[in-house]
Amino acid sequence: RASYVSNPICKGCLSCSKDNGCSRCQQKLFFFLRREGMRQYGECLHSCPSGYYGHRAPDMNRCARCRIENCDSCFSKDFCTKCKVGFYLHRGRCFDECPDGFAPLEETMECVEGCE
């Protein structure tokens, strides 16, 4: 049962407190723990912030850090959707140059099939 439901940080919560925000989320939402100094409060989000992806788990869905090298945003633990500036996206990974047989599309920073 959500308490403090009028508090905007309790949106989408199954369980919420004034001090720590959400501690559990509604089924389709993702838990994200915002840390500020030595304090923290939980949020329930429809989509995870940049640099995180939505990890589904039996106990609770949560946002998890994208750990693909040189990746800014990812769809899952091992599939990048947007690389850091200066890197090209190819099959969910980030490269400083496109592999042989692929050319960089500068506007999207993706590697596409074709000659250079």
Partner: antibody
């Protein structure tokens, strides 16, 4: 292979100081938060300090002002400087990867995923 | 500070048995719970984090269930090498705190 090797423990008198280190290898040291955890003679585990990849430091009240955690990202070494030592600081001190209180990861780095073999500290007169 | 309580200091079991080690937090920790195994003469090793995710290389006989304040580490079929101390830890808010440990003994 992730490897953490502590050194520099020993016997010290109450009120004394000690600095020990943890040499890290097998991973990108500068990208990870690092922590110190101690195990008392009664086998209780207590968090001692954490340092973020960016150098922000965190301590529990029991050691704040007495212990200092630091890191050398060039030599891949984590340090713990302890001063004003008390008998209750007697423990095995482990360095561990992870445990950054300033950042939410949602994965293994929120816990402490690799630990060194530990270095023993005895505070006694 | 959040207090993590492991009610059993010792548990005795036989090879092949199913065993459950419990841990209770003094407040809701949003599944931010890790479990560590410490074998005699060794340092602790991470088994599980975020309540249900097994760390790299951890056998699937180790599982955790629970949410809110109550968490349970289950070993579905105990092996002789599982003789160890087991600790829970909350990684929800600082100071990070650990349970007192449960020593698993093999009959």
């Amino acid at each position: 292979e992730v490897k953490l090797v502590e050194s520099g423990g020993g016997l010290v008198k109450p009120g004394g100081s000690l600095k020990f280190s943890c040499a890290a290898s097998g991973f990108s040291f500068s990208s990870y938060a690092m922590s110190w955890v101690r195990q008392t003679p009664e086998k209780r585990l207590e968090w001692v300090a954490s340092i973020s990849s960016g150098g922000s430091t965190y301590y529990p009240d029991s050691v704040k002002g007495r212990f200092t955690i630091s890191r050398d990202n060039v030599r891949n070494i984590l340090y713990l400087q302890m001063s004003s030592l008390r008998s209750e600081d007697t423990a095995m001190y482990f360095c561990a990867r992870g445990g950054d209180p300033g950042v939410y990861n949602g994965d293994y780095e929120d816990a402490m995923d690799y630990w060194g073999q530990g270095t023993s500290v005895t505070v006694s007169s | 500070d959040i207090v993590m309580t492991q009610s059993h200091k010792f548990m005795s079991t036989s090879v092949g048995d199913r065993v459950s080690i419990t841990c209770k937090a003094s407040q809701d920790v949003s599944s931010a719970v890790a479990w560590y195994q410490q074998k005699p003469g060794q340092s602790p090793k991470l088994l599980i984090y975020w309540a249900s995710t097994r760390h790299t290389g951890v056998p699937d006989r180790f599982t955790n269930s629970g949410s809110g304040t109550d968490y349970t580490l289950t070993i579905s079929s105990v092996q002789a090498e599982d003789l160890a101390l087991y600790y829970c830890q909350q990684h929800y808010s600082t100071p990070w705190t650990f349970g007192g440990g449960t020593k698993l003994e093999i009959k």
